[in-house]
Interface confidence: low
């Protein structure tokens, strides 16, 4: 390897080795290697080897740092948002509103307009504006999957709060799925109160948080203003023309 | 600032500025700044500003990289493990075993022996060896909190698998809590099947995964070997003497 | 990514992770670490060319930012990106200890 | 941490994050970015002294590893640690676009 001067590979390695010498002692806060005078003869105890293996397995399983950024992630992402279908739309009649769940419908054609191909989507967030909350509440997010089944996505423990606050859920995988399925016109999320197995439907806690966009009784301008704050999907995607550029530069390599 | 040559702060700043020029254009895949000839007069459209603000809010809320490593994390961590109290112990009689939950007791005096002070603990993982699983199962982990209440900790969607596999849950906060409370002799975890609100206790899915250490009918040597693979807490902590060293060097500063 | 898969199988002159196995006994003259006997420490090496953004050569420049200067640094430098910890076994007196040392193994590098 | 809190309020000669506000119009001569008008890009600068771990001076050396050479690099370098993205608004023809640029703001640096 050469820059201005020729790099002496062996010298670099030796410096690295010397640095590691200091590093290990330093990490263990030892001024010198510990004496071996009292070490018992024979192999290491089984329990110690087992513990070492457990630790090593953990190392193998998880990297300390995030994955290196894929090439496409270097480039800027276009940001768009798709608002939830308004609650006065008749499609909401399909699901009987309950005290422990709220439903959110999204028009997949609007999503496709924003992100023409699933592969272009780099991140999708479901954003909800929660209003004041007097007590802690544990909520779960689901995606409508097939006829009447729901797929669990994630959960959130919401602390009491005097002021409105935006909640954000990563729903990239779900939106990518919706974009791939041309047939589905609507995508549906459900936000439910968390129910431990010991409780039945009758005993389930009520949904104590108010989500902006589901607040009833507003009329005219005020309804419009608040309607803009209804749940929405925040989308980050590679614009089509940039993706094509990426593709062609990849072919050129 | 000086290294071998005096570093010209202004030059570095200018180079950075020039680099940013290229970086932004490059990220947008533009060869030159876009023409402004067609930009309509007046302020930005409200919807665009709203979208910009949504994106900016996200930026403010979350850093792209993990927090810088605190000083103590630089130093080595001692690794120990504390095995779950064996299931034939009478303390398990306190909780009626159900088809949708399993309970795991840990002796807090053993934890204190391994980690004398809560502040020394840097990570605690609950490790479970799950055996073969034929269908997908969604499980939740709870911590026993007060008399008969359980605090939700986390959840995991387990994919079908033909081979045994170690599951790991980060329970650092819980173990730190147990270490601070001298009065509690036992710490308890509960692993339950996830129950949507629509299902009552009678309809809850059964626990379909087998966890090593709860398998009945083993005797003698085989039971002992399998007992070693029962759930355990893997602890990583700063040894007391190293912590004191850290403390004193902090005071010396 | 400038990781072990790419760098160990290429003759990349620019920034890359370079192979380095540390044998505790042979390289450091240590017998006190019982497990492991050594480890693949690796290290980062190689120039990260500073990319000039002169109007006359913008087209060439823009394509190179991603690899050589993604952070738009004034003086990009080849440094570790992904690091992994290393658990070791050693004795203190008669007592064996297992300890984990953070950020010991370089898995990939980057120009930063 | 070599972050903005520490570095901007100190006269640290070694590796630190340095203050740099980029005004798109004034610094880059650009009028095409409508929002924001500029941003705190910052940058990393300062030496990361290579620490020789000679037996003769271990006591001095060991305390310095953490700050100056935590990765035990043969040639430690001052580089960004925490980075944040930047959203911008600009036009393409008559159409306004909001885009987010990753890793644009340096929040802290490290010797790596």
């Amino acid at each position: 390897l050469s820059t201005c001067k020729t790099i002496d590979m062996e010298l670099v390695k030796r410096k690295r080795i010397e640095a590691i010498r200091g590093q290990i002692l330093s990490k263990l806060r030892l001024a010198s290697p510990p004496s071996q005078g009292e070490v018992p003869p024979g192999p290491l105890p089984e329990a110690v080897l087992a513990l070492y293996n457990s630790t090593r397995d953990r190392v193998a399983g998880e990297s300390a740092e995030p994955e290196p950024e894929p090439e496409a992630d270097y480039y800027a992402k276009e940001v768009t948002r798709v608002l939830m279908v308004e609650t006065h739309n008749e499609i909401y009649d399909k699901f009987k509103q309950s005290t422990h769940s709220i439903y959110m419908f999204f028009n997949t054609s609007e999503l496709r307009e924003a992100v023409p191909e699933p592969v272009l989507l780099s991140r999708a967030e479901l954003r909800l504006l929660r209003l004041k909350l007097k007590v802690e509440q544990h909520v779960e997010l689901y995606q409508k999957y097939s006829n009447n089944s729901w797929r669990y996505l994630s959960n959130r423990l919401l602390a009491p709060s005097d002021s409105p606050e935006w909640l954000s859920f990563d729903v990239t995988g779900v939106v990518r799925q919706w974009l791939s399925r041309g047939s589905e016109l609507l995508g549906v999320f459900k936000l439910s109160v968390h129910c431990p197995c010991e409780m039945g439907p009758g005993h389930a806690d009520e949904m104590r948080i108010s989500i902006e966009g589901f607040t009833t009784g507003r009329r005219g301008d005020l309804a419009t203003i608040h309607g803009m704050n209804r749940p929405f999907l925040l989308l980050m995607a590679t614009p089509l023309e940039r993706a094509q550029h990426l593709q062609s530069s990849r072919h050129r390599r | 600032l000086s290294t071998c040559k005096t570093i010209d702060m202004e030059l570095v700043k200018r180079k950075r500025i020039e680099a940013i020029r290229g970086q932004i254009l490059s990220k947008l895949r533009l060869a030159s700044p876009p023409s402004q000839g067609e930009v309509p007069p007046g302020p930005l459209p409200e919807a665009v500003l709203a979208l910009y603000n949504s994106t900016r809010d996200r930026v403010a809320g979350e850093s792209a990289e993990p927090e810088p490593e605190p000083e103590a994390d630089y130093y080595a961590k001692e690794v120990t493990r504390v095995l779950m109290v064996e299931t034939h112990n009478e303390i398990y009689d306190k909780f009626k075993q159900s088809t949708h939950s399993i309970y795991m007791f840990f002796n807090t005096s053993e934890l204190r022996e391994a980690v004398p002070e809560p502040v020394l603990l840097s990570r605690a993982e609950l490790r479970l060896l799950r055996l073969k699983l034929k269908v997908e199962q969604h499980v939740e982990l709870y911590q026993k909190y007060s008399n008969n209440s359980w605090r939700y900790l986390s959840n995991r969607l387990l994919a079908p698998s033909d081979s045994p596999e170690w599951l790991s849950f980060d329970v650092t906060g819980v173990v730190r809590q147990w270490l601070s409370r001298g009065s509690e002799l036992l710490g308890v975890f509960k692993l339950s099947v996830h129950c949507p609100c629509e299902m009552g206790p009678g309809h809850a899915d059964e626990m379909r995964i087998s966890i090593e250490g709860f398998t009945t009918g083993r005797r003698g040597d085989l039971a002992t070997i399998h007992g070693m693979n029962r759930p355990f807490l893997l602890l990583m902590a700063t040894p007391l003497e190293r912590a004191q060293h850290l403390q004193s060097s902090r005071h010396r500063r | 990514a400038l990781d072990t898969n790419y760098c160990f199988s290429s003759t990349e002159k620019n920034c890359c992770v370079r192979q380095l196995y540390i044998d505790f006994r042979k390289d450091l003259g240590w017998k006190w670490i019982h497990e492991p006997k050594g480890y693949h420490a690796n290290f980062c090496l190689g120039p990260c060319p500073y990319i000039w953004s002169l109007d006359t050569q913008y087209s060439k420049v823009l394509a190179l930012y991603n690899q050589h200067n993604p952070g738009a640094s004034a003086a990009p430098c080849c440094v570790p990106q992904a690091l992994e910890p290393l658990p070791i076994v050693y004795y203190v007196g008669r007592k064996p200890k297992v300890e984990q040392l953070s950020n010991m193994i370089v898995r990939s590098c980057k120009c930063s | 941490a070599l972050d903005t809190n520490y570095c901007f309020s100190s006269t640290e000669k070694n590796c630190c994050v340095r203050q740099l506000y980029i005004d798109f119009r004034k610094d880059l001569g650009w009028k095409w970015i409508h929002e924001p008008k500029g941003y705190h890009a910052n940058f990393c600068l300062g030496p990361c002294p290579y620490i020789w771990s000679l037996d003769t001076q271990y006591s001095k050396v060991l305390a310095l590893y953490n700050q100056h050479n935590p990765g035990a690099s043969a040639a430690p370098c001052c580089v960004p640690q925490a980075l944040e993205p930047l959203p911008i608004v600009y036009y393409v023809g008559r159409k306004p676009k909001v885009e987010q640029l990753s890793n644009m703001i340096v929040r802290s640096c490290k010797c790596s």
Partner: antibody, heavy 120, light 107 residues
Amino acid sequence: EVKLVESGGGLVQPGGSLSLSCAASGFTFTDYYMSWVRQPPGKALEWLGFIRNKPNGYTTEYSASVKGRFTISRDNSQSILYLQMNVLRAEDSATYYCARYTGGGYFDYWGQGTTLTVSS
Amino acid sequence: DIQMTQTTSSLSASLGDRLTISCRASQDISNYLNWYQQKPDGTVKLLIYYTSRLHSGVPSRFSGSGSGTDYSLTISNLEQADIATYFCQQGDTLPWTFGGGTKLEIK
């Protein structure tokens, strides 16, 4: 329109002191580094120093020839740049220009200049 | 300090001519080379910065080129208004330094 107007030049005896001013308008003064440059009669331009902008804490940098004798300061509320000159010598006789300095290493706008003569 | 040398101290040319003024740095200045025009009344204006980038309002008949240590300013189609002294300046390393100037006269 960017405008820089210097004032305060005149005749001073060797060893004396003088303060030059530069009134700035047409731009946000605090956003810019401001610089002083001089030109002795029939000679080249010489950079004397600059004072940094608000994000950079209004710190100063000087050339070796004037360091310790000349001081650059600014009144941001009035958008005025100053050059305080002490222990003046004959070789300090020149036309003094104030200039706006940018991060690109160049001076993009200059004043018309004010003349200093140091003579007994 | 970096020395900037303009070897030609004065230059005569005719209106409409194309002429080049050169400037040499005592070390590589990485394209941080700027050109200024000083009119006979003492007024100074920036013409070109960063070797080749034209400052706003400067006619396109002015152009700059060069790299490393050697740089030049070219004026094509010389006009009466261009009669002035031209200075180069390096912006690579403090202290900023100027060339001695090249005085342009009409034949």
